[in-house]
Every structure is written in structure tokens, then in C-alpha cells.
């Protein structure tokens, strides 16, 4: 399954929207930095496309869930958030189309399940951090920066998969 070129453009638009969402000076938030333990190894080049698609899907689904909460709606600009949802929704559709075409439909490798679980735990850590920080503006900015970084790393994986073919 070849992800459409529009998928790459959508990924770039998503990053641009995340960048635009910033609401306060980041310099006031330095002391709120946190190690969320992004499972970078789960996005390594050792994976075949069949194993990678569901992991990328999980990553985007979790980002969608994170930014769909009422706490998120209160933190960010509504117009930008709506555009952000649209981009993520389109990317989820692209990835789901690949799965439907047969990629990863056969017996799910244990390694892939472990990777999906690692991504879920990563987002659980993010959610816990926000809760502990009482969803403060700085906590949201730290999370936004983290999502930009992790989304960018996973997008780079998509690009490397495309260029390998």
C-alpha cells in the first residue's frame, strides 16, 4: 500500500498547526520540562511497512484523543484545533485504507503489539503529567513541544519507508 503524497503534505500541515497553536512565551516554561520517554525504538528502521502502519496509526489516534479532551479545548484556539483535528482525521483515514488493503491484516506479530502498547503507555505518561500539573498553560506547552518532536520523528519514519520502495 502506497500512502498518498497528500499524506506527507498533511503531516507537514499538522506540524505547522501545532507550531501555530502556541499561546505563551515558552521561556517561562523551562522548569516544567519532563521526560516522557518517547519510545523511539518502536519507530526504528528495522520495521517492515506491515508492522509500521498500525504503530503510526496508534500514534496519530492517541494524538487525536489527547487534543480532543475538554481540557485541551480550553487550552487552545478553537479554529486551529478544528483544523488540527481535520488533518489528523485525514491521516488516520489514509493509514486505515492501507490496513484494509491487506497490510497487517494477517496474523499480528507480537513485536507490533508490543510497539502499540509502548505508544499507549507513552501517552498515558503525557496524560498523567498534564493531570499532575493541573493542565497549566506551561504543561500544555511542554506537551505540545513533545508531540511536535515525536510526531516529527514518526513522520520521518513514513518518509524513509516511502523512499525505500
Amino acid at each position: 500500500c502506497d500512502l498518498p503524497q497528500t499524506h506527507s503534505l498533511g503531516s507537514r500541515r499538522t506540524l505547522m498547526l501545532l507550531a501555530q497553536m502556541r499561546r505563551i512565551s515558552l521561556f517561562s516554561c523551562l522548569k516544567d520540562r519532563h521526560d516522557f520517554g518517547f519510545p523511539q525504538e518502536e519507530f526504528g528502521n528495522q520495521f517492515q511497512k506491515a508492522e509500521t502502519i498500525p504503530v503510526l496509526h496508534e500514534m496519530i489516534q492517541q494524538i487525536f484523543n489527547l487534543f480532543s479532551t475538554k481540557d485541551s479545548s480550553a487550552a487552545w484556539d478553537e479554529t486551529l484545533l478544528d483544523k488540527f483535528y481535520t488533518e489528523l482525521y485525514q491521516q488516520l483515514n489514509d493509514l486505515e485504507a492501507c490496513v484494509i488493503q491487506g497490510v497487517g491484516v494477517t496474523e499480528t506479530p507480537l513485536m507490533k503489539e508490543d510497539s502499540i502498547l509502548a505508544v499507549r503507555k507513552y501517552f498515558q505518561r503525557i496524560t498523567l503529567y498534564l493531570k499532575e500539573k493541573k493542565y497549566s498553560p506551561c504543561a500544555w506547552e511542554v506537551v505540545r513541544a513533545e508531540i511536535m518532536r515525536s510526531f516529527s520523528l514518526s513522520t520521518n519514519l513514513q518518509e524513509s519507508l516511502r523512499s525505500k520502495e
Epitope: L26, K31, R33, H34, E141, R149
Partner: antibody, heavy 121, light 107 residues
Framework: EVQLVQSGAEVKKPGESLKISCKGS????????IGWVRQMPGKGLEWMGI????????AYSPSFQGQVTISADKSISTAYLQWSSLKASDTAMYYC??????????????WGQGTLVTVSS | DIQMTQSPSSLSASVGDRVTITCRAS??????LNWYQQKPGKAPKLLIY???SLQSGVPSRFSGSGSGTDFTLTISSLQPEDFATYYC?????????FGQGTKVEIK
Amino acid sequence: EVQLVQSGAEVKKPGESLKISCKGSGYSFTSYWIGWVRQMPGKGLEWMGIIDPSDSDTAYSPSFQGQVTISADKSISTAYLQWSSLKASDTAMYYCARHPGLNWAPDFDYWGQGTLVTVSS
Amino acid sequence: DIQMTQSPSSLSASVGDRVTITCRASQSIGSALNWYQQKPGKAPKLLIYFASSLQSGVPSRFSGSGSGTDFTLTISSLQPEDFATYYCQQSYDFPLTFGQGTKVEIK
């Protein structure tokens, strides 16, 4: 390969203005902040200030606030440090270094080679 | 501002020695502490970040420990190329501040 390349050494007279540069390459320039550090002859490191190239937001050390201006041009991946009126006490080596912003990643992991500024009448 | 105090300001050691440099912050900074090495005429080089994480490409003889206000840089077995000046730096809050440096010289 990540690189920060600074402009060459400068010799200036007191009262003159100066703008030195730091060009980033090999990474996404707007994803990292750029900090500036001063080292006077035979002395230690002093943090001057920092810029977020994505929107040119800046923060300064109180010791340097109003003495220097930090700016950036993201279209050419370059950060700047400038003086409107140099003093003899500005004679020093100036370094730029990249900072990961709010991400949990190594601080100041890449540095420029330094720009030596000499101010003498 | 957070003050960073390094000790000693200089030390003499021999190749193979175990060297320890300490850094104290004037207030708690969690683990937001970095260590740099600088050789004459060169830019500083990051060794340790977030108190104990070894920067990529740095030899494992370098290690960092501590949290809160007290931190330590240890060189387990000093090598000829390790003779340099070492700086700690807090990255907890602005303004970022450096220690005054520790010069490691050949005995």
C-alpha cells in the same frame, strides 16, 4: 551533520556598532533555540540570552539586557548578536549554541566555533 | 538568579587518577544540570546533561550524579586528553547560569 558556523573575528573601536552571526545547518533551525555565551579573556562562561527562531521570542540575562540585541532570520537559518555601541569591556569570545527548547533533550549540544570580538581604540 | 558554585576551582591529577568535581546550586534545580569540557581555544563540549545522562560520543569514564542542589562530575580514570576546564550549568530556569569552572591540570 549538525553545524553552527559563526562569522569571523572582528576588530572594532569603542562606540562602533557590530552584528555577528551564527548559521545553523543539518537540522530543523526552528525546532531549536539558539543561545549566546560570552567568554572574556582568561575567564569563565557567561550566558547572555537566547532566541526561539520560530517566532523570534527572546530572553536575556539581566547582566546583558539592554546591552545587546539577539535576533534571527529563519529564512536563512541564522541567528545574530548585535551591539549598537561597543565598549572595551565587550572584548571577548562569543559562542552560539543550540538548545532543545522545552523538549527533554541535551542542552547546548552543538556549539559554534566562536567569534572573537576585540574592541580597542 | 540561581548561583552555581563549583569546587575545587583547580586541581592537579595524574593520568589514571579518579577525579571528582562538585557543583552546588543556590536553590533546588531538580536534575536540570549539565557539564561541559573546554580546552584552550576551543568551544565548550557537552559531556553530561540532566545531571546523569551521558552525551552521545562521550567516553564512559565520564559520569554525573546528584539532584536538587548538589551534583558531581566524576572521571573514573583520567586520560591525557581530559586535562581541560570543566563547567557546570543549570538549565532549570532563566537566566541560565554557569559555575566558575574547574581547571584540571597535570600533576
